[in-house]
């Protein structure tokens, strides 16, 4: 799969492949994988992809199920790239405070916060 | 500050304190702090709080600016707790696939994705 495929298209295709291969993926009834308790998904990317790795190692490969795992590894690559962009640019305090304000504002409005 | 204050109220108060103390915080004109290039904030919590630590070490403490940094450390504690909850519960593959589908769905609709 060319990595040039837009990430948004990659995600859509992966969702479709996930539905297609669901029966095959759940074949192992004894397998247990960590599942986050909350819905702040971005905080859990590491655990999600560890789980995907576990699932891949337990799944019979071949056909489009391979494409599913290839897609998921490209999505991981994209997220790793985004994580790199968290700390690459050193800016003045003013810009950092604008970003911090945005971050707290997002926490305030969009995060799923349990008291 | 009691940690019993609801996190949502804590975030609101912190936003107000950030506005109040802006002038004091930007006093150091040579200080540079990593600022994420994108708006997928949850991916960058580690760098954001490292930046807050840098800022705190360079800011004259006293009065309500101390409360600002105390609040920020409580918010960090909350996020660290959320991160712990990413991997604590081991579930069957079906539950993991439901979560993975939700995660990709959120990526598809809510993440800030550049092609």
């Amino acid at each position: 799969i060319p990595t040039e495929i837009p990430t948004s298209a990659l995600v859509k295709e992966t969702l479709a492949l996930l539905s297609t291969h669901r029966t095959l993926l759940i074949a192992n009834e004894t397998l247990r994988i960590p599942v986050p308790v909350h819905k702040n998904h971005q905080l859990c990317t590491e655990e999600i992809f560890q789980g995907i790795g576990t699932l891949e190692s337990q799944t019979v490969q071949g056909g489009t199920v391979e494409r599913l795992f290839k897609n998921l590894s490209l999505i991981k690559k994209y997220i790793d790239g985004q994580k790199k962009k968290c700390g690459e640019e050193r800016r003045r305090v003013n810009a950092f405070l604008d970003y911090l304000q945005e971050f707290l504002g997002v926490m305030n409005t969009e995060w799923i916060i349990e008291s | 500050i009691p940690t019993e204050i609801p996190t949502s109220a804590l975030v609101k108060e912190t936003l107000a304190l950030l506005s109040t103390h802006r002038t004091l915080l930007i006093a150091n004109e040579t200080l540079r702090i990593p600022v994420p290039v994108h708006k997928n904030h949850q991916l960058c919590t580690e760098e954001i709080f490292q930046g807050i630590g840098t800022l705190e070490s360079q800011t004259v403490q006293g009065g309500t600016v101390e409360r600002l940094f105390k609040n920020l450390s409580l918010i960090k504690k909350y996020i660290d707790g959320q991160k712990k909850k990413c991997g604590e519960e081991r579930r069957r593959v079906n539950a993991f696939l439901d979560y993975l589908q939700e995660f990709l769905g959120v990526m598809n609709t809510e993440w800030i994705i550049e092609s």
């Epitope: 962009k85 050193r90 800016r91 003045r92 003013n94 810009a95 604008d98 970003y99 304000q101 945005e102 504002g105 997002v106 | 540079r32 600022v35 994420p36 290039v37 994108h38 708006k39 800030i112 550049e114």
Partner: antibody, heavy 119, light 107 residues
């Protein structure tokens, strides 16, 4: 493709206000800051300020603070720059420009809007 | 505010010439500088960001260098479409500030 399309030319009297619009298309509006820059006839470029459509936060060049107001309408993916108490020296072409990333370079510019202030 | 001093303010050159424009910041701006091209009656267009990174689609004859306070834009072999005014912009600190511009004219 990514585009910023600005409103048409305006002629205003001194003391009046003007509101210039900048309609974004081809990308998710809330992902990028919108900057405003002006250029007086035969002169250089001058930064007015930026607005973050993600949270409506705006920051101004001190020179324009109190006279310029930056706003957005997320439902139409449009940014606005209003300048009040106009004087003849405000005659200029006003540009909107998109930040590539947070506090980053301007990767897309609007075509510009000429504002003429004359009695 | 950070002052950006650009030189020369204008220059005459021929097609094929190598052209260099410099920009000096009044304080350290790291590498947060972009170079912008503007043709008469047209909107500006960013060519280079972060001092030396060429934007996609911009010809490779354009290059940038420098960090801290001193920056340079070079056009290795001037083409007819390159006759324009060039501005540097610092986006390191608020307010963002531009150089006064360098007009590149045909000799």
């Amino acid at each position: 493709q990514v585009q910023l399309v600005q409103s048409g030319a305006e002629v205003k009297k001194p003391g009046a206000s003007v509101k210039v619009s900048c309609k974004a298309s081809g990308y998710t509006f809330t992902n990028h800051h919108i900057n405003w820059v002006r250029q007086a006839p035969g002169q250089g470029l001058e930064w007015i300020g930026y607005i973050n459509p993600y949270n409506d936060y705006s920051r101004y060049n001190q020179k324009f603070k109190g006279r310029a107001t930056l706003t957005v309408d997320k439902s139409t993916s449009t940014a606005y720059m209003e300048l009040s108490s106009l004087r003849s020296e405000d005659t200029a072409v006003y540009y909107c420009a998109r930040d590539y990333g947070n506090f980053w370079y301007f990767d897309v510019w609007g075509q510009g809007t000429l504002v003429t202030v004359s009695s | 505010d950070i002052q950006m001093t650009q030189s020369p303010s204008s220059l005459s050159a021929s097609v094929g010439d190598r052209v260099t424009i410099t920009c000096k910041a009044s304080q350290d701006i790291n590498s947060y500088l972009s170079w912008i091209q503007q043709k008469p009656g047209k909107a500006p267009k960013t060519l280079i960001h972060r001092a030396d990174r060429l934007i996609d689609g911009v010809p490779s004859r354009f290059s940038g260098s420098g960090s801290g306070q001193d920056f340079t834009l070079t056009i290795s072999s001037l083409q007819p479409e390159d006759f324009a005014t060039y501005y540097c912009l610092q986006y390191d600190d608020f307010p963002y500030t531009f150089g006064q511009g360098t007009k590149v004219e045909i000799k």
